[in-house]
């Protein structure tokens, strides 16, 4: 421990001062000596440099003393310069030499944890040996000398879950831990100097270890059975109730999705409210109490996010059973048909049966209904209904030729709840009866010229019948017996028309101005009806070409003349 730059004349010994030394001061440190020193008092030793005189001094024999207690942690060595001179001549005997006085360490410092408080986070269920964090203590003592600053770490609190590596201070997990059982641990670590030997100092640090969540829990329904009700009047899309599962995980690891596992009726759906983490049971199809009054569905719940490595915790989804009761809504009676079509022959006596309507109270098979006819303000009441059994009868004979169809509205009212009323339309067709004889289809103006020849067609006639004209409806035409048959003939064309022909010639206006032909028209109804229709034939003065237009004009003037006489 000396520095000898130029000369080997200096005799050194290692110079140390033990810090914090409390023996009597001044205290001998060591000897400074030149090999030229004959110890006759002729040489003088001079000390300069750090702490010379104030901390260290040297006597005439070259003995160095320390005046006061030293602290290595404040200053661990002092650099001094030694001179030796001839006391008389004041000339150096040796070259100046620099040397060091080291302050020897004693264990006077406790270890210190400077980075606290320590907080660490590690995922739950991490495997044994997982590094959690590292704690490091410092010691003011000399790390290069002895064991004063050599630290050993140990666990004071935290077994059996954690361990600490003695030399490094690395904290590790010693078992898999479940956050859902305990989510925070306080670990106390001790750092001891002197490698744990006697007289060692120690310090402790508390490490707060938080377990972060992993998705190691599947959601589980709170109830194995849920009971919900839905009104049969509820529209599709109605929320009929909620179901709820719990998940011991937190955050996104607890986010869940509900779904239908089993619903053969395909009547319901389940959606997830991600804010409340509830499952909402939704009506997908309308329900009908009278068709089915309860339903059973099975719902399941799964986590939204499950990493592949955690799937082992989610093998079988939790399920629950939901009993859904349909609530009866008192509905109006239901007619067997939305509208009825009935028929009745025209002319039948009043009180004749037209048909029957029927309605029933679906809410109660035993409950009776009351029937009635909605009367129009201006309609004549042609029908009545039996309020108990729904039979409709006529109140007077019907005439198809006045109205071939009647439209009435019938109502059915629940006897136990008269507010519940339903309606049905009844269309009544009046069937034709052959109760009208045929007649001329129009008024005919028929003329015959005085110079007409036999066999001349003077008029085509057709007939109409107020009865229903069926496809095979036929009219037959003939002259009524023994009337003017010598002057005219009727030829039936077999197509519901007939021709009137002259039978002879020599018509004279002077002799007979008009002929009245009674024509018999017969229909093919059942029973057939006939009528006699009179055709008036006017005789007129015609030109040579038998021009009836001229004739008509003449006849017209003549008729005026007749009427004024």
């Amino acid at each position: 421990d000396y520095k000898d730059d130029d000369d080997k004349g200096w005799v050194w010994e290692p110079l140390f001062v033990t810090e914090e030394e409390t023996s009597t001061m001044p205290m001998y440190v060591g000897q400074l000596k030149s090999d030229l020193d004959k110890e006759d008092g002729s040489l003088q030793y001079i000390l300069t440099g750090e702490g010379a005189d104030s901390i260290f001094f040297i006597n005439e024999h070259g003995k160095i003393y320390v005046r006061q207690k030293l602290d290595r942690e404040k200053k661990s060595f002092y650099i001094l310069r030694a001179q030796v001179i001839n006391r008389k001549t004041r000339h150096p005997i040796e070259p100046d030499s620099e040397f060091i006085i080291k302050v020897r360490d004693i264990n006077d410092h406790e270890p210190q944890f400077l980075d606290g408080p320590y907080v660490a986070t590690v995922p739950e269920m991490s495997p044994e040996g997982t590094s959690v964090t590292q704690v490091t203590a410092t010691d003011g003592d000399d790390p290069s000398y002895g064991n004063n600053a050599r630290l050993l770490y140990s666990l004071i609190q935290g077994q059996p879950y954690f361990s600490v590596e003695p030399k490094t201070g690395v904290i590790r997990m010693t078992s898999q831990m479940d956050r859902e059982t305990k989510d925070q641990y306080l670990v106390v670590i001790q750092a001891k100097d002197m490698v744990g030997q006697a007289g060692a100092f120690s310090a402790t640090a508390t490490v707060t270890i938080n377990l972060s969540d992993v998705n190691d829990n599947k959601p589980i329904f709170k109830e194995s059975l849920y009971r919900l009700t839905v009104s049969e009047s509820a529209p599709t899309g109605t929320s009929i109730g909620t179901i709820m599962a719990y998940d011991n995980d937190i955050g996104e690891n607890a986010e869940m999705d509900y779904s239908i596992e089993e619903d053969d009726s395909q009547t319901f759906d389940i959606i997830t409210n991600h804010e409340t983490q509830e499952g909402i049971v939704i009506l997908k199809k309308k329900v009908d109490f009278e068709h089915q009054n309860h339903y059973g569905i099975r719902a399941k719940v799964k986590n939204h996010h499950v990493p592949e490595q955690l799937m082992k915790y989610h093998t079988e989804a939790s399920t629950t059973f939901i009993k859904i009761q349909v609530e009866d809504v008192d509905e109006p009676p239901v007619f067997t048909l939305e509208s009825y079509v009935m028929e009745i022959a025209e002319g039948v006596v009043s009180g004749s049966l037209v048909g029957t309507v029927s309605a029933r109270d679906l809410d109660n098979d035993d409950s009776s209904v009351r029937y009635s006819i909605v009367q129009g303000l201006h309609l004549k009441r042609l029908f009545s209904i039996n309020e108990h059994n729904g039979t409709i009868i006529t109140t007077e004979p019907l005439d198809r030729e006045k109205a071939s169809w009647h439209n009435i509205t019938v109502t059915a009212t629940e006897t136990r709840n008269p507010e519940k009323i339903s309606e049905a339309n009844v269309y009544i067709q009046v069937l034709d009866v052959n109760d009208h004889a045929p007649e001329f289809s129009k008024y005919y103006e028929t003329f015959v010229c005085e110079n007409a020849v036999p066999g001349q067609l003077i008029q085509n006639i057709s007939a109409v019948d107020k009865d229903d004209s069926a496809e095979n409806h036929r009219f037959y035409f003939s002259l009524a017996q023994a009337t003017n048959s010598s002057h005219f003939t009727v030829k039936d064309n077999q197509d519901n028309t007939a021709g009137i022909f002259t039978a002879g010639s020599g018509f004279s206006r002077k002799e007979q101005f008009y002929f009245f032909l009674p024509i018999l028209i017969l229909d093919n109804g059942s029973p057939p009806l006939t009528s006699t229709n009179t055709l008036t034939v006017t005789v007129c003065d015609c030109d040579t070409e038998v021009n009836t237009l001229y004739c008509r004009y003449g006849a017209f003037l003549y008729s005026i003349g007749l009427s004024t006489e």
Epitope: S224, L225, R227, T229, D264, S265, E290, H291, Q292, N293, H294, Y295, G296, F321, K323, Q325, E327
Partner: antibody, heavy 119, light 107 residues
């Protein structure tokens, strides 16, 4: 073990009333829907009425609607059937039955009580 | 209401024989909501099968149920003396109705 014991049956004149009781034990009465079923002498089974586990809903067969009332007293673990305006055709053995928790079938039945309506 | 028709009305068989009972619904029974009961003389009915094919607690495996929609069956693979009784099917899709019963008697 689950037990259902009916009582209150007897002979009654047409038009009169009768109240049947069914004492339940061996299970959590308040968790189950309960029913009455009857069986006319020598005939088959006929469902009569049901009441929900919490007593809020009741349903009846059309044949008894408006005349019979089903009720329950959870504090006494007892089911009731109030029968009014009795008719001859109401003559039967009346059974109370428990509805299965996860189903609508009847997993436990009482031994029945006979109601005879005659003048 | 859903009407259940059971056939045959009576079944005469010997112990050890196989029994097949039929139950037909007037309209489709949703979600196989059908149960079978048996009733011995003077006793209350006892649940055998629910959900058309699931055996109730304590029911021996010689009893099995099958079917869906409108046609259901109860099969007793080998009749035991205590199996001779009246068997009822019940639907619980729409309210609750029972069949008229099938009597299984000793031949």
């Amino acid at each position: 073990q689950v037990q259902l014991v009916e009582s209150g049956g007897g002979v009654v004149q047409p038009g009169r009333s009768l109240r049947l009781s069914c004492a339940a034990s061996g299970f959590t009465f308040s968790s189950y829907d309960m029913h009455w079923v009857r069986q006319a002498p020598g005939k088959g089974l006929e469902w009569v009425a049901v009441i929900s586990y919490d007593g809020t809903n009741e349903y009846y067969a059309d044949s008894v609607k408006g005349r019979f009332t089903i009720s329950r007293d959870t504090s006494k673990n007892t089911l009731y059937l109030q029968m009014n305006s009795l008719r001859a055709e109401d003559t039967a053995v009346y059974y109370c039955a428990r509805e299965r928790y996860f189903d609508w079938s009847f997993d436990y039945w009482g031994q029945g009580t006979l109601v005879s309506v005659s003048s | 209401e859903i009407v259940l028709t059971q056939s045959p009305g009576t079944l005469s068989l010997s112990p050890g024989e196989r029994a097949t009972l039929s139950c037909r619904a007037s309209q489709s029974v949703s979600n196989t909501y059908l149960a079978w009961y048996h009733q011995r003389p003077g006793q209350a009915p006892r649940l055998l099968i629910y959900g058309a094919s699931s055996r109730a607690t304590g029911i021996p495996d010689r009893f099995s149920g099958s079917g869906s929609g409108t046609d259901f069956a109860l099969t007793i693979s080998s009749l035991e003396p205590e199996d001779f009784a009246v068997y009822y099917c019940q639907q619980y899709s729409n309210s609750w109705t029972f069949g008229q019963g099938t009597k299984v008697e000793i031949k």
